[in-house]
Protein backbone atom coordinates (compact mmCIF):
# COMPACT_ATOMS: atom_id res chain seq x y z
CA UNK A 1 0.00 0.00 0.00
CA UNK A 2 1.41 3.43 -1.24
CA UNK A 3 2.01 5.71 2.02
CA UNK A 4 0.25 8.62 1.90
CA UNK A 5 1.89 12.16 1.15
CA UNK A 6 0.31 15.56 2.17
CA UNK A 7 1.56 17.76 -0.74
CA UNK A 8 2.26 21.69 -0.39
CA UNK A 9 4.14 22.46 -3.60
CA UNK A 10 4.84 26.10 -3.05
CA UNK A 11 6.94 27.26 -0.33
CA UNK A 12 6.10 30.89 -0.48
CA UNK A 13 3.19 32.36 -1.94
CA UNK A 14 3.26 36.55 -2.12
CA UNK A 15 -0.55 38.25 -2.30
CA UNK A 16 -1.16 41.91 -2.55
CA UNK A 17 -3.29 43.20 0.38
CA UNK A 18 -6.67 43.09 -0.82
CA UNK A 19 -6.31 40.11 -3.29
CA UNK A 20 -7.34 36.51 -2.35
CA UNK A 21 -4.47 33.72 -2.13
CA UNK A 22 -4.52 30.61 -3.40
CA UNK A 23 -2.31 27.95 -1.06
CA UNK A 24 -2.23 24.66 -2.97
CA UNK A 25 -2.59 21.05 -1.72
CA UNK A 26 -2.86 17.55 -2.66
CA UNK A 27 -2.80 14.21 -1.24
CA UNK A 28 -1.34 11.28 -2.91
CA UNK A 29 -3.85 8.71 -1.54
CA UNK A 30 -7.79 8.66 -0.45
CA UNK A 31 -7.47 5.88 2.59
CA UNK A 32 -7.54 6.22 4.98
CA UNK A 33 -10.74 7.99 5.32
CA UNK A 34 -10.91 11.40 7.33
CA UNK A 35 -10.94 15.11 6.53
CA UNK A 36 -8.60 17.54 5.68
CA UNK A 37 -7.60 20.83 7.57
CA UNK A 38 -5.53 23.80 7.25
CA UNK A 39 -3.79 25.44 10.10
CA UNK A 40 -1.97 28.53 10.30
CA UNK A 41 1.49 27.87 12.67
CA UNK A 42 2.51 24.59 15.03
CA UNK A 43 2.85 24.04 18.09
CA UNK A 44 0.37 25.42 20.95
CA UNK A 45 -0.66 28.47 18.94
CA UNK A 46 -1.93 26.31 15.96
CA UNK A 47 -4.52 27.90 14.08
CA UNK A 48 -7.50 26.43 12.66
CA UNK A 49 -7.79 27.89 9.05
CA UNK A 50 -10.31 25.14 7.31
CA UNK A 51 -12.13 22.42 8.34
CA UNK A 52 -13.56 20.31 5.31
CA UNK A 53 -16.07 18.98 7.65
CA UNK A 54 -17.50 21.06 10.24
CA UNK A 55 -17.11 24.71 11.55
CA UNK A 56 -18.00 28.51 9.56
CA UNK A 57 -14.86 29.70 7.67
CA UNK A 58 -16.44 33.03 5.86
CA UNK A 59 -12.93 33.88 4.00
CA UNK A 60 -12.28 30.32 3.20
CA UNK A 61 -13.55 28.73 0.18
CA UNK A 62 -12.02 24.81 -1.77
CA UNK A 63 -10.87 25.56 -4.45
CA UNK A 64 -11.81 22.15 -6.07
CA UNK A 65 -15.38 20.78 -4.76
CA UNK A 66 -15.13 18.58 -1.51
CA UNK A 67 -17.91 16.46 -2.06
CA UNK A 68 -16.81 15.51 -4.99
CA UNK A 69 -16.12 12.04 -5.15
CA UNK A 70 -11.87 11.25 -5.44
CA UNK A 71 -11.55 14.47 -5.34
CA UNK A 72 -7.81 14.72 -3.61
CA UNK A 73 -7.66 18.57 -4.15
CA UNK A 74 -7.81 20.18 -1.02
CA UNK A 75 -6.53 23.19 -2.35
CA UNK A 76 -7.90 26.77 -0.49
CA UNK A 77 -8.61 30.42 -1.23
CA UNK A 78 -8.47 33.04 1.18
CA UNK A 79 -10.43 36.39 -0.15
CA UNK A 80 -9.55 39.86 0.98
CA UNK A 81 -5.94 39.33 2.22
CA UNK A 82 -4.49 41.60 5.12
CA UNK A 83 -1.25 41.67 6.71
CA UNK A 84 -2.50 40.06 9.53
CA UNK A 85 -2.89 36.83 7.06
CA UNK A 86 0.90 35.86 6.75
CA UNK A 87 2.37 33.14 8.59
CA UNK A 88 3.31 29.55 7.45
CA UNK A 89 -0.06 27.29 6.42
CA UNK A 90 -0.04 23.67 6.76
CA UNK A 91 -2.61 21.58 5.08
CA UNK A 92 -3.24 18.32 7.58
CA UNK A 93 -4.61 15.22 6.72
CA UNK A 94 -6.92 13.59 9.78
CA UNK A 95 -8.15 9.91 9.74
CA UNK A 96 -11.41 9.77 11.07
CA UNK A 97 -11.78 8.93 14.58
CA UNK A 98 -13.29 10.43 17.66
CA UNK A 99 -11.59 12.28 17.65
CA UNK A 100 -9.86 12.76 14.83
CA UNK A 101 -6.27 11.72 14.46
CA UNK A 102 -3.51 13.31 12.69
CA UNK A 103 -1.83 11.64 10.24
CA UNK A 104 0.00 13.51 7.77
CA UNK A 105 1.16 17.53 7.54
CA UNK A 106 2.35 19.24 4.45
CA UNK A 107 5.71 20.89 4.33
CA UNK A 108 3.83 24.45 4.74
CA UNK A 109 3.48 27.61 2.36
CA UNK A 110 4.73 31.27 3.81
CA UNK A 111 2.02 33.53 2.89
CA UNK A 112 3.55 36.82 2.55
CA UNK A 113 1.59 40.03 2.22
CA UNK A 114 2.44 43.05 -0.24
CA UNK A 115 1.26 46.53 0.23
CA UNK A 116 -1.89 47.32 -1.87
CA UNK A 117 -0.73 49.02 -5.06
CA UNK A 118 -1.57 52.51 -5.05
CA UNK B 1 -12.21 39.25 23.28
CA UNK B 2 -12.85 38.12 27.16
CA UNK B 3 -11.52 35.53 28.92
CA UNK B 4 -12.85 34.67 32.68
CA UNK B 5 -11.50 32.58 34.96
CA UNK B 6 -12.82 30.17 37.63
CA UNK B 7 -12.76 27.45 40.40
CA UNK B 8 -9.31 28.62 42.11
CA UNK B 9 -9.17 28.55 46.13
CA UNK B 10 -7.62 26.48 48.96
CA UNK B 11 -6.82 22.65 48.13
CA UNK B 12 -4.23 20.81 50.80
CA UNK B 13 -1.42 19.26 49.38
CA UNK B 14 -2.13 15.73 47.39
CA UNK B 15 -5.81 17.27 46.62
CA UNK B 16 -7.44 18.34 43.22
CA UNK B 17 -8.96 21.37 41.65
CA UNK B 18 -9.90 21.91 38.09
CA UNK B 19 -10.26 26.07 37.05
CA UNK B 20 -12.47 26.83 33.99
CA UNK B 21 -11.45 29.66 31.62
CA UNK B 22 -14.84 31.25 29.60
CA UNK B 23 -14.18 32.60 26.34
CA UNK B 24 -16.04 34.93 24.52
CA UNK B 25 -15.44 37.74 21.69
CA UNK B 26 -13.38 35.51 18.68
CA UNK B 27 -14.24 32.07 17.24
CA UNK B 28 -12.96 29.92 20.14
CA UNK B 29 -12.48 26.73 18.49
CA UNK B 30 -9.97 27.86 16.25
CA UNK B 31 -7.49 29.13 18.36
CA UNK B 32 -4.51 27.97 20.58
CA UNK B 33 -5.05 28.79 24.55
CA UNK B 34 -3.27 28.32 27.43
CA UNK B 35 -2.47 28.63 31.32
CA UNK B 36 0.22 30.54 32.42
CA UNK B 37 0.99 30.60 36.23
CA UNK B 38 2.83 33.38 38.46
CA UNK B 39 3.44 32.01 42.21
CA UNK B 40 3.51 35.30 44.53
CA UNK B 41 6.06 37.78 43.99
CA UNK B 42 7.59 35.76 41.05
CA UNK B 43 7.50 35.85 37.54
CA UNK B 44 5.64 34.26 34.43
CA UNK B 45 5.43 30.32 33.87
CA UNK B 46 4.07 28.64 31.06
CA UNK B 47 1.84 26.01 32.22
CA UNK B 48 0.05 23.97 29.51
CA UNK B 49 -1.78 24.13 25.77
CA UNK B 50 -4.17 23.19 23.60
CA UNK B 51 -3.96 24.25 20.21
CA UNK B 52 -6.72 24.98 17.38
CA UNK B 53 -6.16 20.75 16.55
CA UNK B 54 -6.65 20.04 20.08
CA UNK B 55 -2.86 18.56 20.71
CA UNK B 56 -1.60 19.23 24.35
CA UNK B 57 1.30 20.62 25.69
CA UNK B 58 2.53 20.28 29.23
CA UNK B 59 5.68 22.24 30.96
CA UNK B 60 7.78 19.31 32.79
CA UNK B 61 6.73 19.84 36.31
CA UNK B 62 3.22 19.66 35.97
CA UNK B 63 3.22 16.41 33.11
CA UNK B 64 1.23 13.45 34.98
CA UNK B 65 -0.68 15.55 37.27
CA UNK B 66 -1.72 18.20 35.36
CA UNK B 67 -4.83 17.36 31.92
CA UNK B 68 -5.85 20.48 29.90
CA UNK B 69 -8.69 20.02 27.94
CA UNK B 70 -11.60 22.23 26.21
CA UNK B 71 -15.38 22.13 25.62
CA UNK B 72 -15.35 23.82 22.15
CA UNK B 73 -19.40 24.17 22.61
CA UNK B 74 -18.94 25.83 25.51
CA UNK B 75 -16.37 28.05 24.58
CA UNK B 76 -14.26 27.16 27.69
CA UNK B 77 -10.93 26.00 28.34
CA UNK B 78 -10.42 23.03 31.83
CA UNK B 79 -7.30 22.71 33.57
CA UNK B 80 -7.63 19.55 35.59
CA UNK B 81 -4.63 20.12 38.35
CA UNK B 82 -3.88 16.50 40.50
CA UNK B 83 -1.81 15.47 43.30
CA UNK B 84 -1.13 19.30 44.24
CA UNK B 85 2.16 20.17 45.78
CA UNK B 86 2.94 23.94 47.66
CA UNK B 87 4.86 25.10 44.74
CA UNK B 88 2.13 24.70 42.41
CA UNK B 89 0.63 27.60 44.72
CA UNK B 90 -0.09 30.55 42.28
CA UNK B 91 -2.74 33.06 40.19
CA UNK B 92 -3.66 31.15 36.88
CA UNK B 93 -4.03 33.01 33.76
CA UNK B 94 -5.79 31.68 31.29
CA UNK B 95 -4.72 33.23 27.68
CA UNK B 96 -5.40 33.06 24.23
CA UNK B 97 -2.06 31.81 22.32
CA UNK B 98 -1.65 33.89 18.67
CA UNK B 99 -0.60 31.19 15.83
CA UNK B 100 3.32 32.27 16.14
CA UNK B 101 3.17 30.95 19.77
CA UNK B 102 2.42 34.68 22.10
CA UNK B 103 -0.28 35.72 24.14
CA UNK B 104 -1.65 38.34 22.68
CA UNK B 105 -5.23 37.94 25.21
CA UNK B 106 -5.27 37.40 28.61
CA UNK B 107 -7.64 36.86 31.79
CA UNK B 108 -7.41 38.29 34.96
CA UNK B 109 -6.45 35.14 36.48
CA UNK B 110 -7.89 32.84 39.67
CA UNK B 111 -6.15 32.24 42.69
CA UNK B 112 -4.50 28.60 43.29
CA UNK B 113 -3.16 27.74 47.03
CA UNK B 114 -2.20 24.40 48.28
CA UNK B 115 -1.45 24.64 51.99
CA UNK B 116 -2.31 22.28 55.06
CA UNK C 1 15.27 24.57 26.57
CA UNK C 2 15.85 28.20 26.27
CA UNK C 3 16.37 30.63 29.20
CA UNK C 4 15.82 33.92 29.19
CA UNK C 5 17.71 36.88 31.43
CA UNK C 6 16.60 39.73 31.73
CA UNK C 7 18.59 42.57 33.08
CA UNK C 8 18.81 44.96 35.26
CA UNK C 9 16.71 43.42 37.72
CA UNK C 10 15.15 46.73 38.82
CA UNK C 11 15.68 50.33 37.40
CA UNK C 12 15.04 53.43 39.10
CA UNK C 13 14.10 56.10 36.74
CA UNK C 14 12.39 59.19 36.70
CA UNK C 15 9.59 60.34 34.26
CA UNK C 16 9.83 61.77 31.05
CA UNK C 17 13.23 59.79 30.85
CA UNK C 18 14.08 56.92 28.52
CA UNK C 19 14.22 53.53 29.42
CA UNK C 20 15.91 50.37 28.03
CA UNK C 21 15.35 47.24 28.92
CA UNK C 22 17.51 44.38 27.98
CA UNK C 23 16.71 40.34 27.40
CA UNK C 24 19.54 37.84 26.81
CA UNK C 25 18.70 34.39 24.81
CA UNK C 26 20.88 31.40 25.41
CA UNK C 27 20.31 30.18 21.84
CA UNK C 28 19.33 32.17 18.57
CA UNK C 29 15.80 33.00 18.57
CA UNK C 30 15.64 34.23 15.06
CA UNK C 31 13.93 37.47 16.49
CA UNK C 32 10.79 35.76 18.17
CA UNK C 33 10.57 37.82 21.16
CA UNK C 34 7.60 38.78 22.86
CA UNK C 35 7.78 41.81 25.63
CA UNK C 36 4.72 42.23 28.23
CA UNK C 37 3.69 44.62 30.90
CA UNK C 38 2.57 44.05 34.05
CA UNK C 39 1.12 46.43 37.03
CA UNK C 40 0.71 45.20 40.61
CA UNK C 41 -2.73 43.28 40.56
CA UNK C 42 -3.29 43.15 36.84
CA UNK C 43 -3.04 40.48 34.39
CA UNK C 44 -0.05 40.91 31.75
CA UNK C 45 -0.66 42.82 28.51
CA UNK C 46 1.24 42.52 25.31
CA UNK C 47 3.29 45.57 24.22
CA UNK C 48 5.68 44.07 21.67
CA UNK C 49 6.37 40.61 19.33
CA UNK C 50 8.28 39.65 16.68
CA UNK C 51 10.55 41.65 18.77
CA UNK C 52 9.61 45.11 16.82
CA UNK C 53 5.90 45.04 16.31
CA UNK C 54 4.24 46.52 18.33
CA UNK C 55 0.77 44.91 19.55
CA UNK C 56 -2.95 46.63 18.71
CA UNK C 57 -3.33 49.67 21.26
CA UNK C 58 0.26 50.01 22.22
CA UNK C 59 1.49 54.03 21.91
CA UNK C 60 4.16 54.16 20.04
CA UNK C 61 6.57 54.97 23.23
CA UNK C 62 7.50 51.80 23.28
CA UNK C 63 9.79 50.23 21.11
CA UNK C 64 11.47 46.52 20.37
CA UNK C 65 14.91 45.91 18.92
CA UNK C 66 16.89 43.45 18.28
CA UNK C 67 18.12 39.86 16.70
CA UNK C 68 20.34 36.79 17.29
CA UNK C 69 20.26 36.59 21.14
CA UNK C 70 19.79 39.79 22.66
CA UNK C 71 16.75 41.99 22.23
CA UNK C 72 15.94 45.40 23.94
CA UNK C 73 12.82 47.02 24.78
CA UNK C 74 12.94 50.58 24.85
CA UNK C 75 10.26 53.22 26.33
CA UNK C 76 11.67 56.69 24.94
CA UNK C 77 9.63 58.87 27.42
CA UNK C 78 8.73 57.21 30.36
CA UNK C 79 5.00 58.25 31.51
CA UNK C 80 3.66 57.23 35.22
CA UNK C 81 1.76 54.69 33.90
CA UNK C 82 4.62 52.96 32.88
CA UNK C 83 5.78 51.59 36.13
CA UNK C 84 5.74 48.47 36.29
CA UNK C 85 7.34 44.84 35.56
CA UNK C 86 7.87 44.04 32.18
CA UNK C 87 8.61 40.04 31.05
CA UNK C 88 10.35 38.67 27.96
CA UNK C 89 9.06 35.74 26.05
CA UNK C 90 10.38 33.82 23.21
CA UNK C 91 8.38 31.93 21.23
CA UNK C 92 10.79 30.28 18.84
CA UNK C 93 10.85 27.04 20.86
CA UNK C 94 7.66 25.53 22.20
CA UNK C 95 8.71 22.89 24.07
CA UNK C 96 8.35 24.68 26.01
CA UNK C 97 7.30 28.42 25.98
CA UNK C 98 9.80 30.77 28.32
CA UNK C 99 10.12 33.93 30.36
CA UNK C 100 12.26 35.83 31.35
CA UNK C 101 12.07 36.69 35.27
CA UNK C 102 11.03 40.58 34.72
CA UNK C 103 12.73 44.04 35.03
CA UNK C 104 10.97 46.17 37.35
CA UNK C 105 10.61 49.62 36.60
CA UNK C 106 10.03 52.15 39.53
CA UNK C 107 9.59 55.81 40.56
CA UNK C 108 13.30 57.08 41.33
Known amino acids: EEELQVIQPEKSVSVAAGESATLNCTATSLIPVGPIQWFRGVGPGRELIYHQKEGHFPRVTPVSDPTKRNNMDFSIRISNITPADAGTYYCVKFRKGSPDVELKSGAGTELSVRAKPS | VQLVESGGGLVQPGGSLRLSCTAS????????MSWVRQAPGEGLEWVSA???????YYTDSVKGRFTISRDNSKNTLYLQMNSLRAEDTAIYYC???????????WGLGTLVTVSS | EIVLTQSPGTLSVSPGERVTLTCRAS??????IAWYQQKPGQAPRLLIY???SRATGIPGRFSGSGSGTEFTLTITSLQSEDFAVYYC??????????FGGGTKVEIK
Open chain 2, 95 to 105: AKVTWNNFFDY
Open chain 2, 25 to 32: GFTFRNYG
Open chain 3, 27 to 32: QGIAGK
Open chain 3, 50 to 52: DAS
Open chain 2, 50 to 56: SSGSGST
Open chain 3, 89 to 98: QQHYDWSPLT
